[in-house]
Interface confidence: medium
């Protein structure tokens, strides 16, 4: 099939990085500056993506591949191929139309992006709250109250960092 196609279509001989110039008897010409063709046999080159404003260049455009963008500090990518940049918020916040807002009580966000999500309801799994939630962190669920033997503590104290009476080396 390829051989037949080549005989019928001179453009199939044009490699990636070039285009088949119909203005010149289908001579292959290199892509103009700021354009690319990622496959052979193309009749036009595609315009390179330009990473401007809040976008910054992660990978430069070449004659055979498009530029790739990411976002400037304080922003993060959204959408396929980083089609949008969205403002970062602090942990414990979410982005609203009015800007970054603290998570409401009972919700948290441990990232700089995304929305505040409700704390886990430990009781739905028959467990108890081992560590309370904050705006930045979900609650930590522990064993169910019935699993705890009388007098047992639900929190194990940490081991001492060093033996008492010894100075650090």
């Amino acid at each position: 099939f390829e051989r037949t196609r080549s005989l019928q279509d001179p453009c199939s001989n044009c490699p990636a990085g070039t285009f088949c110039d119909n203005n010149r008897n289908q001579i292959c010409s290199p892509c103009p500056p700021n354009s690319f063709s990622s496959a052979g046999g193309q009749r036009t080159c595609d315009i390179c993506r330009q990473c401007k404003g809040v976008f910054r260049t992660r990978k430069e455009c070449s004659s055979t591949s498009n530029a790739e963008c990411d976002c400037t500090p304080g922003f993060h990518c959204l959408g396929a191929g980083c089609s949008m940049c969205e403002q970062d918020c602090k942990q414990g916040q979410e982005l609203t139309k009015k800007g970054c807002k603290d998570c409401c009580f009972g919700t948290f966000n441990d990232q700089k992006r995304g929305i505040c999500r409700p704390w886990t309801n430990c009781s739905l799994d028959g467990k108890s709250v081992l560590v309370n939630g904050t705006k930045e962190r979900d609650v930590v669920c522990g064993p169910s109250p019935a699993d705890l033997s009388p007098g047992a503590s639900s929190v194990t104290p940490p081991a001492p960092a060093r033996e008492p009476g010894h100075s650090p080396q």
């Epitope: 001989n13 990085g17 010149r24 008897n25 010409s29 290199p30 103009p32």
Partner: antibody, heavy 120, light 107 residues
Amino acid sequence: QVQLQESGPGLVKPSETLSLNCTVSGGSISNYYWSWIRQPAGKGLEWIGRIYTSGNTNYNPSLKSRVTMSVDTSKNQFSLKLTSVTAADTAVYYCARDGNWNYADAFDIWGQGTMVTVSS
Amino acid sequence: DIQMTQSPSSVSASVGDRVTITCRASQGISSWLAWFQQIPGKAPKLLIYTASGLQSGVPSRFSGSGSGTDFTLTISSLQPEDFATYYCQQTNSFPFTFGPGTKVDIK
């Protein structure tokens, strides 16, 4: 700035193969077509053919059966082989950069040329 | 193949003269024409691309015009370093072909 330098034997025996290299310095060989042109003494210029950095070639039909071009991007070099040479192939051989789109296949940078004589 | 012809084949001129060289293609080549200057013993040098585009670093006394089959290279005021042979070349279709050249020498 980009410079081209042809290299190869100045004397080739009839019926043998002429082999020339062109080294590109001061810039990348990538994303251009590269041509070979020859000029017999006191005569005009003849385009031999061109090669793209991917290895894609176009040859002058008058020489096609005898010409092979290749490219070595790692060495920033491209080469010409012309088989079954005769005295009519005696000429100055030039390599040239071809196909920077801005110049629409005009040869904007040339080597200084190398004289090849076909004689026994 | 597209045949390129040039006229005159040679011209004698003096410094300061206006010199015009014509190039004709055997079939239409749109604007896919370049002009080169060659000094004896040197490689050709690109002067004009796509019929009228002045190559970077080339003095503005050189200009090109034309499209289709008829093209012109003009040197508005000939300088001593301009005495050379001038070639036109088409890149409209394979094989790329050159004109036979026009020699500009001192009158």
